[in-house]
Interface confidence: low
């Protein structure tokens, strides 16, 4: 199929372009070039008959184009107005017409482009600034570089105007850089000159350097005021609200007690019209004051705040020291100093934090010690306590319960029987109690200023006979040769005597076993297999007596090295071998083979029938007690004979 | 005019990696910088990463670390490797130049599908 290709599609003004013709058709009678998409003579711009070879020009032809024998069209110093549509008209030799359409664009060769901006001195968080790329060119491409980047993502940042204009909203100081744009089209890029933003600003809150504010008597003040600021801000000082001077460095030498004041620094922009100020306290000391501490939190909270303490005053070229109970400071990580040690922060305070603490200053002749400071932690209250420990009571003695509580500022106590709130004190006294005393006793506990409430609940029954008792454990699977165990028997009553018995025996004397608690517990350590018995309490008073329900102790043990029976271990060819292994466990234990080392299966009996030699070697049995987690093992080697040959006899027997 | 067919695209787990490919026909930096665009659904079309003819590179926030664009001059073709991905990467991504004069040429873009 015939086809234009325009080389090159986009054109440059003044330069040229060649409309090359692709799959031009043999025997031509000739050619014509016309303007537009369509063929009409109006605009025809050169005909070609292959037979004279000559070439037309038509009402188009501006003299700058060429026609080639492959009848491509070569336009030379190309004008805006050429761009567009071409249209080549072939007729063969048989008169039959073909048509096809090139194209291409001409665009202007760009000039440098430059920046204008509407505001040439914006002031900070005040001002826009739209920067527009010049000049406005049809068919261009605009873009934006700042210090040579192209332009951050930002809210701040509005491209507008077919990206013609950048606005900067809301200046910052940060703003200020260098602003290029640049324009493009499809033949050229030309980048402008940089445009600098000069962000006026300020002046910022000024600093006062050195920081320090104490002074002694005979040194020299020399203070410094900074304000980020542009132009640069202009300083004043003032001293106790006094014009002193419009420099940035105030100078007093062998300054007094006297000098002591507010001094103030005054910045000041001239263009922005802004001013801020900056006061510091200065003091002068004629000898080195007696040091004290001043806390930033009264009344910490334990395990909730941080305590700073700091040692006043604030003197140059002093070394600070601290002291707590009368020691220097122990290494914790809880307790952190300052750069300078005059400040002393204690991370998470706990109740073991009181102190005292004391500060120093030292001087040339001695260290000035703070009076000690003492820090009121609050905490607590703990899970408070009830005390005596009984359950059981006898009907017609008196119950007298005490509740404490761990707590500062002290507890306030509640106490409520079956949830009914009883009184708020901190002991409870029911005189000559009956059966219908037994109930829950609560005791509540509250802190009034962290407002922390904390409850125990015990549980009083008053009979005249005991209970059944039953025995509580500490360990319901204990292993063998490693645990211990403690039988505790419940419940607890008073004016009551406990008793063991060990298989229907009482106890035996062991140096494993052990009575404490008035008897009523009972700890066998190092417990064996042979402690796996029932266990029975019994508690009697002068009314009654009961025993618990037998408890019987599971020792996991084991396992033990195995037994691989039969324990014989030769045998003649063609028999069966039948091997199996034992060991004493508990749990029973997982038993596993290896012939030669190669594992064969998980049981607990390994069957081969009828061997020959090559069944000789090591049989090992592996047992395994998941519980206890240990394993054990053992090997025995079978040899296996030719029939005929009877292992053990010698020959001619 | 540039035209632009965007590849690469598929389902992947979250904390995977893809690679997306924009083939150019014209000059690939026809207006000096080409860029990759995703749109999830329901939302507007957003920039991810952008490369200029001299090769610096610019990145959103939402994926800097994590996707990489680089370019083939000579192969007039745009790349974004894609690592780490998360299921909110999910959506369809495009490629174009940066600036809003290419945008009337968009490609029919390739599906990013992070499941998690």
């Known amino acids: 199929k015939l086809t234009i290709e325009s080389t090159p599609f986009n054109v440059a003004e003044g330069k040229e372009v060649l409309l090359l013709v692709h799959n031009l058709p043999q025997h031509l009678f000739g050619y014509s070039w016309y303007k537009g998409e369509r063929v009409d003579g109006n605009r025809q711009i050169i005909g070609y008959v292959i037979g004279t070879q000559q070439a037309t020009p038509g009402p188009a032809y501006s003299g700058r184009e060429i026609i080639y024998p492959n009848a491509s069209l070569l336009i030379q110093n190309i004008i805006q107005n050429d761009t567009g549509f071409y249209t080549l008209h072939v007729i063969k030799s048989d008169l039959v017409n073909e048509e096809a359409t090139g194209q291409f664009r001409v665009y202007p060769e760009l000039p440098k482009p430059s920046i204008s901006s509407n505001n040439s001195k914006p002031v900070e968080d005040k001002d826009a600034v739209a920067f527009t790329c010049e000049p406005e060119t049809q068919d261009a491409t605009y873009l934006w570089w700042v210090n040579n980047q192209s332009l951050p993502v930002s809210p701040r940042l509005q491209l507008s105007n077919g990206n013609r204009t950048l606005t900067l909203f809301n200046v910052t100081r940060n703003d200020t850089a260098s602003y290029k744009c640049e324009t493009q089209n499809p033949v050229s890029a030309r980048r402008s000159d940089s445009v600098i933003l000069n962000v006026l600003y300020g002046p910022d809150a000024p600093t006062i350097s050195p920081l320090n504010t104490s002074y002694r008597s005979g040194e020299n003040l020399n203070l410094s005021c900074h304000a980020a600021s542009n132009p640069p801000a202009q300083y004043s000082w003032f001293v106790n609200g006094t014009f002193q001077q419009s420099t940035q460095e105030l100078f007093i030498p062998n300054i007094t007690v006297n000098n002591s004041g507010s001094y103030t620094c005054q910045a000041h922009n001239s263009d922005t019209g802004l001013n801020r100020t900056t006061v510091t306290t200065i003091t002068v000391y004629a000898e080195p004051p007696k040091p004290f501490i001043t806390s930033n939190n009264s009344n910490p909270v334990e395990d909730e705040d941080a305590v700073a303490l700091t040692c006043e005053p604030e003197i140059q070229n002093t070394t600070y020291l601290w002291w707590v109970n009368n020691q220097s400071l122990p290494v914790s990580p809880r307790l952190q100093l300052s750069n300078d040690n005059r400040t002393l922060t204690l991370l998470s305070v706990t109740r073991n934090d009181v102190g005292p603490y004391e500060c120093g200053i030292q001087n040339e002749l001695s260290v000035d010690h703070s009076d000690p400071v003492i820090l009121n932690v609050l905490y607590g209250p703990d899970d408070p306590t009830i005390s005596p420990s009984y359950t059981y009571y006898r009907p017609g003695v008196n119950l007298s319960l005490s509740c404490h509580a761990a707590s500062n500022p002290p507890a306030q106590y509640s106490w409520l029987i079956d949830g009914n709130i009883q009184q708020h004190t901190q002991e409870l006294f029911i005189s000559n109690i009956t059966e219908k005393n037994s109930g829950l006793y609560t005791c509540q506990a509250n802190n009034s200023a962290s407002g922390h409430s904390r409850t125990t609940v015990k549980t009083i029954t008053v009979s005249a006979e005991l209970p059944k008792p039953s025995i509580s454990s500490n360990n319901s699977k204990p292993v063998e040769d490693k645990d211990a165990v403690a039988f505790t028997c419940e419940p607890e009553a008073q004016n009551t005597t406990y008793l063991w018995w060990v298989n229907g025996q009482s106890l035996p004397v062991s140096p494993r076993l052990q009575l404490s608690n008035g008897n009523r517990t009972l700890t066998l350590f190092n417990v064996t297999r042979n402690d796996a018995r029932a266990y029975v309490c019994g508690i009697q008073n002068s009314v009654s007596a009961n025993r618990s329900d037998p408890v019987t102790l599971d020792v996991l043990y084991g396992p033990d090295t195995p037994i691989i029976s039969p324990p014989d271990s030769s045998y003649l060819s063609g028999a069966n071998l039948n091997l199996s292994c034992h060991s004493a466990s508990n749990p029973s234990p997982q038993y596993s083979w290896r012939i030669n080392g190669i594992p064969q299966q998980h049981t607990q009996v390994l069957f081969i029938a009828k061997i020959t030699p090559n069944n000789n070697g090591t049989y090992a049995c592996f047992v395994s007690n998941l519980a206890t987690g240990r394993n054990n093992s053992i090997v025995k080697s079978i040899t296996v004979s030719a029939s005929g040959t009877s292992p053990g006899l010698s020959a001619g027997a | 005019q540039l035209q632009l067919v965007e590849s690469g695209g598929g389902l992947v787990q979250a904390g995977g990696s893809l690679r997306l490919s924009c083939a150019a026909s014209?000059?690939?930096?026809?207006?000096?910088?080409m860029a990759w665009f995703r749109q999830a659904p329901g939302k507007q079309r957003e920039l991810v990463a952008a490369i200029t003819s001299a090769g610096s590179t610019n990145y959103a926030d939402f994926v800097k670390g994590r996707f990489t664009i680089s370019a083939d001059n000579a192969k007039n073709t745009l790349y974004l490797q894609m690592n780490s991905l998360k299921p909110e990467d999910t959506a369809v991504y495009y490629c174009?130049?940066?600036?809003?004069?290419?945008?009337?040429?968009w490609g029919q873009g390739t599906q990013v599908t992070v499941s998690s």
């Open positions: 174009n130049t940066p600036w809003p004069v290419g945008r009337d040429y």
């Open positions: 014209g000059s690939l930096f026809r207006i000096n910088a």
